[in-house]
């Protein structure tokens, strides 16, 4: 047993049928020696009476909010979580799998650029007395500095009966040095806790791995004289990192007709123009990426051929 | 990355041809080198991250650029004199050009050449003759060190004579890439910078 | 403490109404408050619930057909367009109001709605 | 989400002994509930958290279970047990607070 916050513990289980469960000792914080009992939740059956309560934790019913009373007066309380063993692993229900990058990742991260300022979202189907901390560190061993705020409710999405929720935090290395070299990863860790359940995730990344840049802007087409050929410019996010001659992008261009069927052209550049044929219904897109670490593209920022 | 991509003009500043083809050369060693050794922990997240030229050369601080000199997290052992020779900065007036930048990024390439032909001539040795080094990264090294055109002591290679563990060996390999793929692109954004300059 | 339901009647299809449940004893913004229904001979059947906090949310096949909210003492479900197929008796009940959500221990005795033309 | 109640009516001599079934589509934990409910009147409270008696429940009545598979255990039957008894998750508002089929007990 430990404790997560103050009067708040998380009891490890092994969760398999006929498990033994734990034996957990509760302190009824008070000087009062006599004349103490305990009750579990909102039921007035009294448990057991004295300054400790012995219980033996094996399912959910024996977690929830133990109070300490007497004489018909609340003096203190604490409130078990479970946190469940399977088969030698913890279990993890509340989040979703995502499955991208690789299979078990429930936790993702994207960074808009080197600032040591990010983003991790997480998905999950339960609506309700669900909550979320979060905690981050670069390194392990001698952990420095990143603040996160509170995890908010992102995006609900319908996905067939269902419902999606998405939750996501911001956090900011506390003394980041955009142009760095990453040798110690990034540590985030989420406690969930639903209901009595407790789950931690983790998720361990450089910053460079995770840079999404924001699409180009002020993307615009110059017709070129007597000709089919158009000429395309576009400028720098304001989000990326500064000076772009040192953080610089390299970009992609793509003409798509209406159909997507049809085939696309791709021009790769390193420069913010390019000439291309603008053909009839098609549109032209252009996306960015850094020139030199190649991370996730950003997304595409478009506009009509005509 | 293979993309199409529009070939640098040959009148620019003359390092950044040479630093970009350093990038793309270390990058194809590291993706063969994983590919080579997939069951051999070789990916980002299973490797050590250590940095060989860790408190013998400070490119990232020498090389800073001046618009990040601001910033109080970025000038841990900053030095601030200027350099004034290597052939990269011929006609090149630029107040960016901090001592130690161009000769650190020399350094860094000298110590990394002499670990990556050590451990070439430990991996040649190898009776399952598994992965060598690519020689046309050693070529880049070379002609990047040559354009950097600084003078300095030969460092010996080392030589060692117990029998080598292979296994370590490859695994010291990807380590080594890594960090060099890593330094290799600061190098390249120094480059650009420079060039912009 | 006691939660009693009202406003229950013959309505023609597609005429709105709204039943109202009505609270004593305890205040609404620390229980979650559920409506179920049960048709003549039927099983319960859950509409959908409004938490301590005011969120409401509803079983899937409701698709916008009730609407529940809630004031300091009452808690309202509204059917915004009726059809035969919703004659039930209509039961609110309150939750446990434990730390974490709610099994829902105080029902009141229902209200017969009749949808008939 | 459903929850899937077994078997839909039972039959019993007095004092012997009943089980009800409530097969749930995912994981629910312990968050089950069993109800009482006879003719004109609303449900009852029986059980809570799958195996928690409620207040001025008689302890013949007996909840266990957890996860997806739930039993709700009657002994020492008497008359005044004729009834339906419904379970119902409490899981999670998306996953719903839904009831399962009912399981009418007749006293013989």
């Known amino acids: 047993i430990w404790e997560l916050k103050k009067d708040v513990y998380v009891v490890e289980l092994d969760w398999y049928p006929d498990a033994p469960g734990e034996m957990v000792v509760l302190t009824c914080d008070t000087p009062e020696e006599d004349g103490i009992t305990w009750t579990l939740d909102q039921s007035s059956e009294v448990l057991g009476s004295g300054k400790t309560l012995t219980i033996q934790v094996k399912e959910f019913g024996d977690a929830g909010q133990y109070t300490c009373h007497k004489g018909g007066e609340v003096l203190s309380h604490s409130l078990l979580l479970l946190h469940k063993k399977e088969d030698g692993i913890w279990s993890t229900d509340i989040l979703k799998d995502q499955k991208e990058p690789k299979n078990k990742t429930f936790l993702r991260c994207e960074a808009k650029n080197y600032s040591g300022r990010f983003t991790c979202w997480w998905l999950t189907t339960i609506s309700t007395d669900l909550t979320f901390s979060v905690k981050s560190s670069r390194g392990s061993s001698d952990p420095q500095g990143v603040t996160c705020g509170a995890a908010t409710l992102s995006a609900e999405r319908v996905r067939g009966d269902n419902k999606e929720y998405e939750y996501s935090v911001e956090c900011q290395e506390d003394s980041a040095c955009p142009a760095a070299e990453e040798s110690l990863p990034i540590e985030v860790m989420v406690d969930a806790v639903h209901k009595l359940k407790y789950e931690n995730y983790t998720s361990s990344f450089f910053i460079r791995d995770i840079i999404k840049p924001d699409p180009p802007k002020n993307l615009q087409l110059k017709p070129l004289k007597n000709s089919r050929q158009v000429e395309v410019s576009w400028e720098y996010p304001d989000t990326w990192s500064t000076p772009h001659s040192y953080f610089s992008l390299t970009f992609c261009v793509q003409v798509q007709g209406k159909s997507k069927r049809e085939k696309k052209d791709r021009v790769f550049t390193d420069k913010t123009s390019a000439t291309v044929i603008c053909r009839k219904n098609a549109s032209i897109s252009v996306r960015a990426q850094d020139r030199y670490y190649s991370s996730s593209w950003s997304e595409w920022a478009s506009v009509p051929c005509s | 990355r293979n993309l199409p991509v529009a070939t640098p003009d040959p009148g620019m500043f003359p390092c950044l041809h040479h630093s970009q083809n350093l990038l793309r050369a270390v990058s194809n060693m590291l993706q063969k080198a994983r590919q080579t050794l997939e069951f051999y922990p070789c990916t980002s997240e299973e490797i050590d991250h250590e940095d060989i030229t860790k408190d013998k050369t400070s490119t990232v601080e020498a090389c800073l650029p001046l618009e990040l000199t601001k910033n109080e997290s970025c000038l841990n052992s900053r030095e601030t004199s200027f350099i004034t020779n290597g052939s990269c900065l011929a006609s090149r007036k630029t107040s960016f050009m901090m001592a130690l930048c161009l000769s650190s990024i020399y350094e860094d390439l000298k110590m990394y050449q002499v670990e990556f032909k050590t451990m070439n001539a430990k991996l040649l040795m190898d009776p399952k003759r598994q992965i060598f080094l690519d020689q046309n990264m050693l070529a880049v090294i070379d002609e990047l060190m040559q354009a950097l055109n600084f003078n300095s002591e030969t460092v010996p290679q080392k030589s060692s004579l117990e029998e080598p563990d292979f296994y370590k060996t490859k695994i010291k390999l990807c380590i080594l890439l890594h960090a060099f793929r890593i330094r290799a692109v600061t190098i390249d954004r120094v480059m650009s910078y420079l060039n912009a300059s | 403490q006691s939660v009693e339901e009202s406003g229950g009647r013959l309505v023609t299809p597609g005429t709105p109404l709204t039943l109202t449940c009505t609270v004593s004893?305890?205040?609404?913004?620390?229980?979650?408050m559920i409506w179920v229904r049960q048709a003549p001979g039927e099983g319960l059947e859950w509409i959908g619930i409004?938490?301590?906090?005011?969120s409401a949310y509803y079983a899937s096949w409701v698709n916008g057909r009730f609407t529940i909210s809630k004031t300091s003492t009452t808690v309202d479900l509204k059917m915004t367009s009726p059809t035969t197929g919703d004659t039930a008796t209509y039961f609110c009940?309150?939750?446990?109001?434990?730390?974490?959500?709610?099994?829902?221990?105080?029902w009141g005795p229902g209200t017969l709605v009749t949808v008939s033309s | 989400f459903e929850l899937t109640q077994t078997p839909s009516s039972v039959e019993a001599a007095v004092g012997g002994t009943v089980t009800i079934k409530c097969q749930a589509s995912q994981s629910i934990d312990s968050w089950l509930a069993w109800y009482q409910q006879k003719p004109g009147q609303p449900p009852k409270l029986l059980i809570y958290?799958?195996?928690k008696l409620a207040t001025g429940v008689p302890s013949r009545f007996s909840g266990s279970g957890s996860g997806t598979q739930f039993t709700l255990t009657i002994s020492d039957l008497e008359c005044a047990d004729a009834a339906t008894y419904y379970c119902q998750s409490y899981y999670d508002a998306n996953a719903g607070y839904g009831f399962g089929g009912g399981t009418k007990v007749v006293v013989v």
């Open positions: 004893g305890f205040s609404l913004s620390s229980y979650t």
């Open positions: 009940a309150r939750g446990s109001g434990t730390y974490t959500s709610d099994y829902f221990n105080i």
């Open positions: 958290s799958a195996s």
């Open positions: 409004i938490s301590a906090g005011g």
